[in-house]
C-alpha cells in the first residue's frame, strides 16, 4: 500500500491502486480505491499522468471538473459517479492509445485527509488465438489465428502427448501488420498433427498470455481459449 | 491558421532580468499545453518548460527551476517565460511551442534571441 | 531524465535515397515521440507525432517505426527540400528531451 501523508493538519488516508493493462481501441479501467467519506461533496478525485502537462481527470463537488484536463484526454474519461461515495475512484479511459502507457497518480482529498497512490498502466494489444484443422493443406494441420497483437508476441506450440517436445521445427509463424499500422495478426501453422492429441497454441508478450486448445479425436474436435493479462499488481 | 510570435528576448547582463511573450492566434488558446524549447547557437533542441491550458499545472528544467516561471493569460491568448539570475548557458533562441490535438510539439514560433553577455 | 541518443548524427545522401534515422531512448517511452524537421535559420516543424502518425500536411515519403525504448525516422525517397536535421523528442516523462540532432547533407 502506498499512503499519502497528511498536510495542513490533516491525517493521510489510504489509496490503493492495481497495475493493469489497456488494449489498444479499447475502453481501459484505472483502477483506484480509497476510505470513503460520509459526504460526496467533500471528496476530491485527481488522475495525474507522468509527462502530461494537463490533468488526467477531476471530480469534485459530486461532479467532473475538466477545465485543468489536459487536451489528450478530452472526452475519453470518466469516473463511476455513483460509487464515489464508497470509495471507488476508478478511472474509465475510452478509446485506450499506444501512448496512454506509463505512470499514473491517483490523488484523494477527503475530510478525513489526504493521499495518493501511483499505478502503471500498460498498452498493447491483446486477442483470443482460434485454432481449426487446416484441411486444405496436404498434411494433418492446425492453424493458430489471432487478430491484434502488440508488441510481437512470441508463439509457441505444445501438446498433451508429447509433453516438452519442441514443435518449432514443425511450425511456421507470421506476422501480418493490421491496416492501423501498429497492431498485428498472428497466424501460426502446425505441421504433422496426430489424432486423438490435444495441442495448445499459446502467444505471449509482455501484456498479456493467450491460449488456445484444440483436441481432435476421430469422431469430434473440441475447441477452448484463454486469456489472462500479465502483471496486475496492487500499490 | 495558428499562430505563434515570440517577442521581448535581447542583450541582458548576467544575473539580469527579461519576460518574454508569445502571442497564439488561430486556435481556441486555452485548450492547449503550451511549452518553451531553446536551441543555443549551433546547437540542439531543449525542452525548458511548460504549462497546461488552465494554466494550474507547471513544469521546468531542473537548470532553470528557481529562475524562470512560466504563465499564461488565457483571456489574452498570450503566454509568458519571466527570467531572472539570468547565466551565460541561457544565451539561445527561445522557441514558443504549442500543443495539439495529440502531441505537445505541433506549432512552433520562430523564435527570439535571448543574449546573456556583459 | 530520460536520454534520448540519436543516430547517425550526420549523413550524406543523394536525392531519391532511402535514409533511416534511429533513437534510442534510456527507458522505454510507450511511442511518446516525436520526429522534428528544421532548417537553417528557421523553427523546427512537427512530422510525426505518437511513433508512428504523420502530421497533416506531411508527405507520404516519411514514416515512423518502433516500440518501446527504439524508434526510427524514415524518408523512403529523398526530396531536395529533406535536406535538413531531423530531431526525435520525448514527451512520456518531464523533463521532456531531444536527441542530439541528425543532419542530412547533400552528397
Known amino acids: 500500500l502506498i499512503i499519502g501523508f497528511g498536510i495542513s493538519g490533516r491525517h493521510s488516508i489510504t489509496v490503493t491502486t492495481v497495475a493493469s493493462a489497456g488494449n489498444i481501441g479499447e475502453d481501459g479501467i484505472l483502477s483506484c480505491t480509497f476510505e470513503p467519506d460520509i459526504k460526496l461533496s467533500d471528496i476530491v478525485i485527481q488522475w495525474l499522468k507522468e509527462g502530461v502537462l494537463g490533468l488526467v481527470h477531476e471530480f469534485k463537488e459530486g461532479k467532473d471538473e475538466l477545465s485543468e484536463q489536459d487536451e489528450m484526454f478530452r472526452g475519453r474519461t470518466a469516473v463511476f459517479a455513483d460509487q464515489v461515495i464508497v470509495g471507488n475512484a476508478s478511472l474509465r479511459l475510452k478509446n485506450v492509445q499506444l501512448t496512454d502507457a506509463g505512470t499514473y497518480k491517483c490523488y484523494i482529498i477527503t475530510s478525513k485527509g489526504k493521499g495518493n497512490a501511483n499505478l502503471e498502466y500498460k498498452t498493447g494489444a491483446f486477442s483470443m488465438p482460434e485454432v481449426n484443422v487446416d484441411y486444405n493443406a496436404s498434411s494433418e494441420t492446425l492453424r493458430c489465428e489471432a487478430p491484434r497483437w502488440f508488441p510481437q508476441p512470441t508463439v509457441v506450440w505444445a501438446s498433451q502427448v508429447d509433453q516438452g517436445a519442441n514443435f518449432s521445427e514443425v511450425s511456421n509463424t507470421s506476422f501480418e501488420l493490421n491496416s492501423e499500422n501498429v497492431t498485428m495478426k498472428v497466424v501460426s501453422v502446425l505441421y504433422n498433427v496426430t489424432i486423438n492429441n490435444t495441442y495448445s497454441c499459446m502467444i505471449e508478450n509482455d501484456i498479456a498470455k493467450a491460449t488456445g486448445d484444440i483436441k481432435v479425436t476421430e469422431s469430434e474436435i473440441k475447441r477452448r481459449s484463454h486469456l489472462q493479462l500479465l502483471n496486475s499488481k496492487a500499490s | 491558421e495558428v499562430q505563434l510570435l515570440e517577442s521581448g528576448g535581447g542583450l541582458v547582463q548576467p544575473g539580469g532580468s527579461l519576460r518574454l511573450s508569445c502571442a497564439a492566434s488561430g486556435f481556441t488558446f486555452s485548450r492547449y499545453g503550451m511549452s518553451w524549447v531553446r536551441q543555443a547557437p549551433g546547437k540542439g533542441l531543449e525542452w525548458v518548460s511548460g504549462i497546461n491550458g488552465g494554466g494550474s499545472y507547471t513544469y521546468y528544467l531542473d537548470t532553470v527551476k528557481g529562475r524562470f516561471t512560466i504563465s499564461r493569460d488565457n483571456a489574452r491568448n498570450t503566454l509568458y517565460l519571466q527570467m531572472s539570475s539570468l547565466r551565460a548557458e541561457d544565451t539561445a533562441v527561445y522557441y514558443c511551442v504549442s500543443q495539439g490535438s495529440n502531441y505537445y510539439f505541433d506549432y512552433w514560433g520562430q523564435g527570439t534571441l535571448v543574449t546573456v553577455s556583459s | 531524465d530520460i536520454r534520448m541518443t540519436q543516430s547517425p548524427s550526420s549523413l550524406s545522401a543523394s536525392v531519391g535515397d532511402r535514409v533511416t534515422i534511429t533513437c534510442h531512448a534510456s527507458q522505454g517511452i510507450s511511442s511518446n515521440i516525436g520526429w522534428l524537421q528544421q532548417k537553417p535559420g528557421k523553427a523546427p516543424k512537427a512530422l510525426i507525432y505518437?511513433?508512428?502518425n504523420l502530421e497533416d500536411g506531411v508527405p507520404s515519403r516519411f514514416s515512423g517505426s518502433g516500440s518501446g525504448a527504439d524508434y526510427t525516422l524514415t524518408i523512403s525517397s529523398l526530396q531536395p527540400e529533406d535536406f535538413a536535421t531531423y530531431y526525435c523528442v520525448q514527451y512520456a516523462q518531464f523533463p521532456y528531451t531531444f536527441g542530439g540532432g541528425t543532419k542530412v547533407e547533400i552528397k
Open positions: 505518437h511513433g508512428t
